[in-house]
């Protein structure tokens, strides 16, 4: 009856500071809306990056000011960060919540450790 | 520092009501779900009834369905829970309780106590 | 409904000693498992979640095992302040649901 989350381990961020992965859950019920929501995990500390609920079958739907975007196909949803820093570098775990109907569900995956390293300046011209 | 404090408890006959307050403090509360939780006296925890961040979302325990309503107010930082048709199988001590990121219930109030006695 | 049963239902330890408690659900819960710890006239607390990590400001000397259906809190050595009654609790799906709960007390 648990539900199971699965997603990369390793994503390396572009240089442009855009990160990409897939979180694919196991679906115990017949949900027809699902919350998803993106943690990040540093030194056993966990705070919420963004989060979003979609009814299936519709896209998701982030807050404008959010990091992230997001598509949805069935039980998989592509989840992008964008803006990341080489500071941002940590373990981003996808958080799966079957909302509705009743019964609640719970999924957490293992995390997706994202790299970022921050480009290096442009060497001044003369 | 995180708090959450109950009130609203005290004796009532069966088949009378009461609502219990939770105030929120130290934490946003619009952003996490809450929940109650009760304890008979000597006995074990019971979870209640369970409310998302938005309201949107609202579960409830079998023996409650349909005499308990979960509610709360954001702006206010409140959670509340009226309860309506007390049994005496209704006492018993009430906690709110936050739901942790992760999905345990990681913050509880000291509790309160509902007493249903004639 | 999920049936989460603790056993034993009560461990007589002194201290300094390995308390061993367990938890077995109906059915798999994966690893969505809390242990809690209340006091005579106080709130239970969290200690351990997701089956095996200590929650903040929780001591070492506590942690936790399993997946599944079987899992265990273990105390290694018991300190006066340990003695109270365990909870655990599975979060993965409503209704959220509770273990009859393992007292400890000292022998």
């Known amino acids: 009856k648990a539900m199971h989350v699965a997603q990369p381990a390793v994503v390396l961020a572009s240089s442009r500071g855009i990160a990409s992965f897939v979180c694919e859950y196991a679906s115990p019920g017949k949900a027809t809306e699902v919350r998803v929501t993106v943690l990040r995990q540093a030194d056993s500390q966990v705070t919420e990056v963004c989060a979003a609920t979609y009814m299936m079958g519709n896209e998701l739907t982030f807050l404008d000011d959010s990091i992230c975007t997001g598509t949805s196909s069935g039980n998989q949803v592509n989840l992008t960060i964008q803006g990341l820093r080489a500071m941002d570098t940590g373990l981003y775990i996808c958080k799966v919540e079957l909302m509705y109907p009743p019964p609640y569900y719970l999924g957490i995956g293992n995390g997706t450790q994202i790299y970022v390293i921050d480009p290096e300046p442009c060497p001044d011209s003369d | 520092e995180v708090q959450l404090v109950e009130s609203g408890g005290g004796l009532v006959k069966p088949g009378g009501s009461l609502r219990l307050s939770c105030a929120a403090s130290g934490f946003t509360f619009s952003s996490y779900s809450m929940n109650w939780v009760r304890q008979a006296p000597g006995k074990g925890l019971e979870w209640v009834s369970s409310i998302s961040s938005s309201s949107s979302y609202i579960y409830y325990a079998e023996s409650v369905k349909g005499r308990f309503t979960i509610s709360r107010d954001n702006a206010k930082n409140s959670l509340y829970l009226q309860m309506n048709s007390l049994r005496a199988e209704d006492t018993a001590v009430y906690y709110c309780?936050?739901?942790?990121?992760?999905?345990?219930?990681?913050?509880w109030g000291q509790g309160t106590m509902v007493t249903v006695s004639s | 409904e999920i049936v989460l049963t603790q056993s034993p239902g009560t461990l007589s330890l002194s201290p300094g000693e390995r308390a061993t408690l367990s938890c077995r659900a109906s059915?798999?819960?994966?690893?969505?498992l809390g242990w809690y710890q209340q006091k005579p006239g106080q709130a239970p607390r969290l200690l351990i979640y997701?089956?095996?990590t200590r929650a903040t400001g929780i001591p070492d000397r506590f942690s936790g095992s399993g997946s599944g259906t079987d899992f265990t809190l273990t105390i290694t050595r018991l300190e006066p302040e340990d003695f109270a009654v365990y909870y655990c609790q599975q979060y993965g799906s409503s209704p959220w649901t509770f273990g009859q709960g393992t007292k400890v007390e000292i022998k």
């Open positions: 309780a936050r739901v942790g990121l992760m999905g345990p219930f990681d913050i």
């Open positions: 059915q798999s819960v994966s690893r969505y």
């Open positions: 997701g089956a095996s």
